[in-house]
Structure formats: structure tokens, C-alpha cells
């Protein structure tokens, strides 16, 4: 999906008001310095692409994020504020959500959510030059 036509300010508002809090809750008990940010993004559409990938695509060691509250809220925000956010995209993540039986918070998942926090912070500051 091409995120170019999303209403970025509305997505940012959804992030600031609710998604960010859920990410913090998920990471509670973890030191902010515990993980290095290895995933980056260059502009808002790119950030959303990376955010979607990390949130909904299962990775080795972390296959359960799609069931988390921050993931459901992310999906809702994209469904509302990204015109034509593909039905197949939502259906695919819906299927993944149904396929997972339990929520397991592994260290790999914590690292992945730490990366997500970094991507969202970058999304919120689009005018900053890439490090």
C-alpha cells in the first residue's frame, strides 16, 4: 500500500492521544536504553510502511503483536485516515490476528516495539534531517 495520501496530521493526533500510551504500557518495566534503534524511516509514508510491517508482519521470535491494543489502534487509524487502505491489507492482518492463539511477550517482541516507538517518533518529526 502506498501511504502517500494518508492524512498524516490526523494519524499523528491518534498516535499522540492513544497509540503512544499503549506502546508505553507494553514496554513498561523495560529501560529505554535497553534496545538500540536499528530500523529507520526517511519520510512519513516510509515511516508508515515500516510501522505497518513491524506491527503486523510476524518475525522470528515475535509473532503476536497484531493482537495488542496498540496494533488494533494503529490498524484503525490507517483504516480511517488512509484513503483506500487496501482491503487485502486489512484482511491479511485480520487473518493473522485470528491465527494467533495467545499473546506472548518475548524479549524479541519488546525489541520490536522499541523499534516501533522510534519509528513513530520519527513519523511525528518529519522535518528533522535523517541522522
Amino acid at each position: 500500500y502506498d501511504f502517500t495520501n494518508c492524512d498524516f496530521e490526523k494519524i499523528k493526533a491518534a498516535y499522540l492521544s492513544t497509540i503512544s500510551k499503549d506502546l508505553i504500557t507494553y514496554m513498561s518495566g523495560t529501560k529505554s536504553t535497553e534496545f538500540n534503534n536499528t530500523v529507520s524511516c526517511s519520510n512519513r509514508p516510509h515511516c508508515l510502511t515500516e510501522i505497518q510491517s513491524l506491527t503486523f508482519n510476524p518475525t522470528a521470535g515475535c509473532a503476536s503483536l497484531a493482537k495488542e491494543m496498540f496494533a488494533m489502534k494503529t490498524k484503525a487509524a490507517l483504516a480511517i485516515w488512509c484513503p483506500g487502505y487496501s482491503e487485502t491489507q486489512i484482511n491479511a492482518t485480520q487473518a493473522m490476528k485470528k491465527a494467533r492463539k495467545s499473546k506472548v511477550t518475548t524479549n524479541k517482541c519488546l525489541e520490536q516495539v522499541s523499534q516501533l516507538q522510534g519509528l513513530w517518533r520519527r513519523f511525528n518529526r518529519p522535518l528533522l534531517k535523517q541522522q
Partner: antibody, heavy 120, light 111 residues
């Protein structure tokens, strides 16, 4: 069972406000969008706006911006629609409708409708 | 923000097929696959018959089908039955400024 139950008919004076409620049961209220749609006598359907409690997002149709307020109480699974500065043209049946989870623009469940009559 | 355009009326005999059109623009019907159709009997709430322009919710007879070409969506009712007599409304997602548009409605009469 899965349903939306709306509050009863209202008769209002021009210039006043009306608040209609819509109680959901049988499904996880917060995940869906609850839209409000109205139908004037003998006329077509008109979308007023939607609330998605999961993300606390409310969107209003441009025509009703500033005059309509949609809220939701997730503890009671109830959505509300308040329309202010009523005029005779606002006489209509007001429906709440559930937008499918993440497909908020397909209304797969409707309330029974609330007739709002605006008359002096 | 004008409504989608539907013919005010359509009719057919029992057993026949009838097609109702719904014309929009590239900003709504033409731009997305998010077209839905609703059936409304007098004094009743609307009922979802078609969504995503050609999908049927469970419980809707397969006599009802949807299609889309360019800026126009269509609802076809085949094997008309007396209970199909109702008003039919199309609706389309219209982007993040307008969101939802409805057609003016088509009264389907079974002769």
C-alpha cells in the same frame, strides 16, 4: 443478541437541541464505528458522522460540522448524537448504524430509528 | 458533496432480472472499491445487501449481485420476488474529506 437499540421519538422546538442514544449489545462496541444516518420524510439517506471509540476518533459530515456532536460511553456501550440549532428541515428519522470492524463505511447493523420532529 | 446518482424508479416482473445503476465520480465510486447497497422496506431500517461493490453478507440471497465499472456501480436482482419490492440505496466511501456518500435511492417495483 447483536443489536442496536435507540431512544424514543422526540418533538422539539426550532432552535433547541436533541440528543438521541444508541445502545449496543452482543458485540465488542469499541472496535466498531458507530455512524449516524438520517432520513427526512419521503427522502433518501444522509450521513451525519461516525465515532470509532477504539481510537477516540469522531468525524462529521461537512454539512453538519459545528451543529452535531457524536459521543460514546464504552462502559455502557452507548453512542449518542446531539444536534443543535434545530430547524424544521431537521425533522427526520435518525438511525445509528454499525460500521464493520476496520471497514467503518459498510453499515451491517442498524438501530430501529428515532423520529425527531421539529415544530413550533 | 452531491449525492451519488440513481434512477428514481425501476421495475420488473417476478422471475425477471433488474439492474439499478449508481453513478459517482473518480473521487468516490471510481477511486475506491468501497461501494455498498442497502435495501429498505417502508417503515423499516435499511439492510446491507452488498459491500466492497460485489460481496454479499451472510444471509443475503445470491440473487443479489453487485458490479462496478469506472465511476458507476450496479446492483442486479435476478429472479425477482415480491419481497424484493423496496427502496435501494447505494453508498460509497469518498476519501478522507467526505467519507460517506449515499445515492438518492431507487424504488424497485415488482409488477
Amino acid at each position: 443478541q447483536v443489536q442496536l437499540v435507540q431512544s424514543g421519538a422526540e418533538v422539539k422546538k426550532p432552535g433547541s437541541s436533541v440528543k438521541v442514544s444508541c445502545k449496543a449489545s452482543g458485540f465488542t462496541f469499541g472496535s466498531y464505528g458507530i455512524s449516524w444516518v438520517r432520513q427526512a420524510p419521503g427522502q433518501g439517506l444522509e450521513w451525519l458522522g461516525v465515532i470509532v471509540p477504539l481510537v477516540g476518533v469522531t468525524i462529521y459530515a461537512e454539512k453538519f460540522q459545528g451543529r452535531v456532536t457524536i459521543t460514546a460511553d464504552t462502559s455502557t456501550s452507548t453512542a449518542y448524537m446531539e444536534l443543535s440549532s434545530l430547524r424544521s428541515e431537521d425533522t427526520a428519522v435518525y438511525y445509528c448504524a454499525r460500521g464493520q470492524e476496520y471497514f467503518y463505511w459498510y453499515f451491517d447493523l442498524w438501530g430501529q430509528g428515532t423520529l425527531v420532529t421539529v415544530s413550533s | 458533496q452531491s449525492a451519488l446518482t440513481q434512477p428514481p424508479s425501476a421495475s420488473g416482473s417476478p422471475g425477471q432480472s433488474v439492474t439499478i445503476s449508481c453513478t459517482g465520480t473518480s473521487s468516490d465510486i471510481g477511486g475506491y472499491n468501497r461501494v455498498s447497497w442497502y435495501q429498505q422496506h417502508p417503515g423499516k431500517a435499511p439492510k446491507l445487501m452488498i459491500y466492497e461493490f460485489n460481496k454479499r453478507p451472510s444471509g443475503v440471497p445470491d440473487r443479489f449481485s453487485g458490479s462496478k465499472s469506472g465511476n458507476t456501480a450496479s446492483l442486479t436482482v435476478s429472479g425477482l420476488q415480491a419481497e424484493d419490492e423496496a427502496d435501494y440505496y447505494c453508498s460509497s466511501y469518498a476519501g478522507t474529506d467526505i467519507f460517506v456518500l449515499f445515492g438518492g435511492g431507487t424504488k424497485l417495483t415488482v409488477l
